[in-house]
């Protein structure tokens, strides 16, 4: 058993049918010695008396808010949560496996640049009685500071019969140098509590590996005289690290017909312009990627050929 | 030690070309190592990230773009600093600053070259003959060093009398390749910056 926060405790259980559970001793936070009784949640049934209460915690029915009283007055509370260990592996019931980029990916994180700011998000089908708390650091043995905000509900989607809820959090490394070569990964820890169930999820990454630039901005077309060709031009996104000559991007320009089946023409360039043939009803899209370290491509920025 | 915006030497352009070749070569070598050594801990998540140039060279700091010298986080990791604020820049020859940066890159390349050659000698003794260093990568390191055109003492190749532990050697190869790829990215960024300046 360990303390999650004041008066909230997590009991770790080896979770299998007929498991013996864990013996837990609760102590009433009071100078009083006599006439103390204990109850669980809203029930008025007295579970025991005395300054301490010994309970065998086996299942969720044994978890909850234990309260010690004296003469109708509440003295203190202890909330017990359960953390299930199923065959040597901590349970992951609360969050959905996003399966990207690999199985058992519960937290996904992205950064728009090398400033040390990043966003993480996760999915769940649970809509109520759910709380999250997020901590982060650079490295684990001698951790350096990363400050995270509060997790917020950022999207709701309908997936078949189920509703899916997306939560996200923004974090900022306290003293980040965009040009630094990372040798210690960022660690992100999310505590999730659903009713009386506690779970924790972690992710470890280097900022360089989670970079995803914003799409190029100011995408424009300039028709070339006496030609079906157009000059496409664009600019680096505002959120990208500067100077751009140091933090350079490379670009992919795509000409896509109305039909998804039509052949796509693609050009790769380090410049912020390209000459392409603009077909009728086609659209031109451009996306960006770090020129020197192949992390994710940005989303496409698009303009119609007409 | 910071990189000011300067008129590049005509010699910068071949360096940019060579640095791009270097990044391509080390990335290919790393990919090959990860595939060949699939039963070894060779992914970025599994290895310890060590930098053999730590405390010996200071390429990131020496080659810092002028725009980042105002960022305290980019300066506080320096042990010794020639320039601690932008106002000193005017009184110093920009070519001196560039020379410091480029010599630091040269020293990096020299250290990695020695490590890779020593490692290759060990890998050639492996009866499994599982993996060797790409000669192209070694050649590209050499070409960039020549293009940088610094004279420095040649470091003797380390020789080891004891029987090599091939498992450890292959893990060290992965560690070295990951670190060298990150340094090659920095070198490429620097060359691109100098080229544009």
């Amino acid at each position: 058993i360990w303390e999650l926060k004041k008066d909230v405790y997590v009991v770790e259980l080896d979770w299998y049918p007929d498991a013996p559970g864990e013996m837990v001793v609760l102590t009433c936070d009071t100078p009083e010695e006599d006439g103390i009784t204990w109850t669980l949640d809203q029930s008025s049934e007295v579970l025991g008396s005395g300054k301490t209460l010994t309970i065998q915690v086996k299942e969720f029915g044994d978890a909850g808010q234990y309260t010690c009283h004296k003469g109708g007055e509440v003295l203190s509370h202890s909330l017990l949560l359960l953390h299930k260990k199923e065959d040597g592996i901590w349970s992951t019931d609360i969050l959905k496996d996003q399966k990207e980029p690999k199985n058992k990916t519960f937290l996904r994180c992205e950064a728009k640049n090398y400033s040390g700011r990043f966003t993480c998000w996760w999915l769940t089908t649970i809509s109520t009685d759910l709380t999250f708390s997020v901590k982060s650091s650079r490295g684990s043995s001698d951790p350096q500071g990363v400050t995270c905000g509060a997790a917020t509900l950022s999207a709701e989607r309908v997936r078949g019969d189920n509703k899916e809820y997306e939560y996200s959090v923004e974090c900022q490394e306290d003293s980040a140098c965009p040009a630094a070569e990372e040798s210690l990964p960022i660690e992100v820890m999310v505590d999730a509590v659903h009713k009386l169930k506690y779970e924790n999820y972690t992710s470890s990454f280097f900022i360089r590996d989670i970079i995803k630039p914003d799409p190029p901005k100011n995408l424009q077309l300039k028709p070339l005289k006496n030609s079906r060709q157009v000059e496409v031009s664009w600019e680096y996104p505002d959120t990208w690290s500067t100077p751009h000559s140091y933090f350079s991007l490379t670009f992919c320009v795509q000409v896509q017909g109305k039909s998804k089946r039509e052949k796509k023409d693609r050009v790769f360039t380090d410049k912020t312009s390209a000459t392409v043939i603009c077909r009728k009803n086609a659209s031109i899209s451009v996306r960006a990627q770090d020129r020197y370290y192949s992390s994710s491509w940005s989303e496409w920025a698009s303009v119609p050929c007409s | 030690r910071n990189l000011p915006v300067a008129t590049p030497d005509p010699g910068m352009f071949p360096c940019l070309h060579h640095s791009q070749n270097l990044l391509r070569a080390v990335s290919n070598m790393l990919q090959k190592a990860r595939q060949t050594l699939e039963f070894y801990p060779c992914t970025s998540e599994e290895i310890d990230h060590e930098d053999i140039t730590k405390d010996k060279t200071s390429t990131v700091e020496a080659c810092l773009p002028l725009e980042l010298t105002k960022n305290e986080s980019c300066l506080n990791s320096r042990e010794t600093s020639f320039i601690t604020n932008g106002s000193c820049l005017a009184s110093r020859k920009t070519s001196f600053m560039m020379a410091l940066c480029l010599s630091s890159i040269y020293e990096d390349l020299k250290m990695y070259q020695v490590e890779f050659k020593t490692m290759n000698a060990k890998l050639l003794m492996d009866p499994k003959r599982q993996i060797f260093l790409d000669q192209n990568m070694l050649a590209v390191i050499d070409e960039l060093m020549q293009a940088l055109n610094f004279n420095s003492e040649t470091v003797p190749q380390k020789s080891s009398l004891e029987e090599p532990d091939f498992y450890k050697t292959k893990i060290k190869l992965c560690i070295l390749l990951h670190a060298f790829r990150i340094r090659a990215v920095t070198i490429d960024r620097v060359m691109s910056y100098l080229n544009a300046s």
Epitope: D14, W15, Y16, P17, D18, A19, E59, F60, K85, E86, D87, G88, I89, D93, K102, N103, K104, T125 | F39, P41, E46
Partner: antibody, heavy 115, light 111 residues
């Protein structure tokens, strides 16, 4: 004590369907994940499928994906395996099993796919 | 397709020490705990070892388990006639959990 009693096995022709049941008692069935495991005659153990305690997630071996469906009825304390498009290579003893460091197995039920 | 490899058979005389190996990889045994089962003819498997080296109550202490790196082993010290059975190791793979990964199985013969 924990008990898992299986039923529903038998002889079936290729291409036909069969449903296996596993009745649980002696524990809070709705709190635990459950597996199906099979063993072809003279062969080793092969995992078939898993279902979470609340039925929200199901996982299958590639060899049965798209043909077999694992399900549970927590109000009846029963686990099911619906087997469709059966093949000769599905012939085996099928076991249900609880998930956890200490597990409990059903007695097994024989499924024979033969024409 | 079994990812955990066991020797097909091992044998020993009563009182001898018999060991069975179970070889896997970094993503399964290297990352997860190992169980061992004993299966007597015509019966369901019986749990002998969980958590690499833990014995459930009721399992004789002549059975012991261990794990090192990407391999695990089961030892029977002082093998007895009633130990003649098939033995299976079981683990998980980090990418496919909760799918059970079984070993190929080992037939123990007591001579």
């Amino acid at each position: 004590q924990v008990q898992l009693v299986q039923s529903g096995g038998g002889v079936v022709q290729p291409g036909r369907s069969l449903r296996l049941s596993c009745a649980a008692s002696g524990f809070t069935f709705s709190s635990y994940g459950m597996h199906w495991v099979r063993q072809a005659p003279g062969k080793g153990l092969e995992w078939v499928a898993f279902i979470r305690y609340d039925g929200s997630n199901k996982y299958y071996a590639d060899s049965v994906k798209g043909r077999f469906t694992i399900s549970r009825d927590n109000s009846k304390n029963t686990l099911y395996l619906q087997m469709k498009s059966l093949r000769a290579e599905d012939t085996a003893v099928y076991y249900c099993k609880t998930h956890g460091s200490h597990d409990n197995w059903g007695q097994g039920t024989m499924v024979t796919v033969s024409s | 397709s079994y990812v955990l490899t066991q020797p097909p058979s091992v044998s020993g005389t009563p009182g001898q020490r018999v060991t069975i190996s179970c070889s896997g990889g970094r993503s399964n045994i290297g990352d997860n705990t190992v169980k061992w089962y004993q299966q007597l003819p015509g019966t369901a498997p019986k749990l002998l070892i969980y958590g690499n080296d833990q014995r459930p109550s009721g399992v004789p202490d002549r059975f012991s388990g261990s794990k090192s790196g990407t391999s695990a082993s089961l030892a029977i010290t002082g093998v007895q006639a009633e130990d003649e059975a098939d033995y299976y190791c079981q683990s998980y793979d980090r990418g496919t959990h909760p799918a059970l990964l079984f070993g190929t199985g080992t037939k123990v013969t007591v001579l």
